[in-house]
């Protein structure tokens, strides 16, 4: 899997999208997990609704939300009030039984707030030693979802 980089500004919201094949993953719940080390486990942060038909309902764990457009095949994760410690490697997953398929590997980078005049030196950025040769950057512009943007699945 290539790694997609999403950059957000500290204190703002970052929206991460993970596209997938809606037919292949039909009926499957999804999850957002944080990679603990390069070879370590992926620790679950938040997962979609227990009832797959209600996957469109936004589920929160702390400042992280997840919602799934099961018809269009897009999983959306929102990291609210982004903080330096949110930077790191994550995965979007499709769950089946006790197994999990990786939909997308995501590197979250936290940029200093340009309006914040404090020393930006305490912001953590992924080190040069981490190799993401295949990574491509998606600049995610922070904004609130407009009414009607939350997608819905079919129900029968």
């Amino acid at each position: 899997h290539n790694t997609t980089v999403f950059q957000g500004v500290a204190g703002q919201s970052l929206q991460v999208s993970c596209p997938y094949d809606s037919m292949k993953h039909w009926g499957r719940r999804k999850a957002w997990c944080r990679q603990l080390g390069e070879k370590g486990p992926c620790q679950r942060v938040v997962s979609t609704h227990n009832l797959w038909l209600l996957s469109f309902l936004r589920r929160w764990n702390g400042s992280t939300a997840i919602t799934d457009d099961t018809l269009g095949g897009t999983l959306t994760i929102t990291l609210r009030n982004l903080q330096p410690h949110d930077a790191g490697l994550y995965q979007c997953q499709s769950l089946h039984g006790s197994e999990a398929d990786t939909l997308r590997k995501v590197l979250v980078e936290v940029l200093a707030d340009p309006l914040d005049h404090r020393d930006a030196g305490d912001l953590w950025f992924p080190g040069e030693s981490e190799s993401f040769e295949d990574a491509h950057v998606e600049h995610s512009i922070s904004r609130s979802l407009l009414e009607g943007e939350i997608p819905f699945p079919p129900t029968s």
Epitope: N50, W60, G148, P151, P153, T155
Partner: antibody
Framework: QVQLVQSGAEVKKPGSSVKVSCKAS????????ISWVRQAPGQGLEWMGG????????NYAQKFQGRVTITADESTSTAYMELSSLRSEDTAVYYC???????????WGQGTMVTVSS | EIVLTQSPATLSLSPGERATLSCRAS??????LAWFQQKPGQAPRLLIY???NRATGIPARFSGSGSGTDFTLTISSLEPEDFAVYYC?????????FGGGTKVEIK
Amino acid sequence: QVQLVQSGAEVKKPGSSVKVSCKASGGTFSSYAISWVRQAPGQGLEWMGGIIPISGTANYAQKFQGRVTITADESTSTAYMELSSLRSEDTAVYYCARTQEYTLFDSWGQGTMVTVSS
Amino acid sequence: EIVLTQSPATLSLSPGERATLSCRASQSVSSYLAWFQQKPGQAPRLLIYDASNRATGIPARFSGSGSGTDFTLTISSLEPEDFAVYYCQQDYHWPITFGGGTKVEIK
């Protein structure tokens, strides 16, 4: 601001059908789930079923399966709940509710009183 | 189906007092529980979702807690407008179900 406006009160005979409407304004109608909940006089709330307008398909509580039909007309941003083979115990206030973000019941219509009496 | 049992059925309190309402599920609903307030002649209003998150515009005196089978809605200091019926609701399993309600009345 999301608003749900329901049709007026109905008086029906046992064995007949009733169709209650719920017109939505604010936001994109096709992107929201609409549910129907009823409340008999002095009683609690009972989920009947719901629809995702973009797909036009509905989910029903087993208790109402075969007797209730929930539909939506995107062109008029209106959802409908039709209940057939009415009996006196169907006398209740029928509410439509719409998801906005968090639950299936983020915002509610004002309710429609349906009285079943011979 | 999951049965939600609310207790007490009626709670008689005075303005300014603390109200503690209970909702017990017949089996685990994880954190998939919401609380609604309903006043006479009105539609219900969402107060709490996901067991502990306040809905937009809901005053801080309302708080929810619990997970699994036992949940609590707390109103820290009752205001005159808080006297109403409160319902819990789960959507962890089909069908979606509501509790029987707790009426909070003025003592």
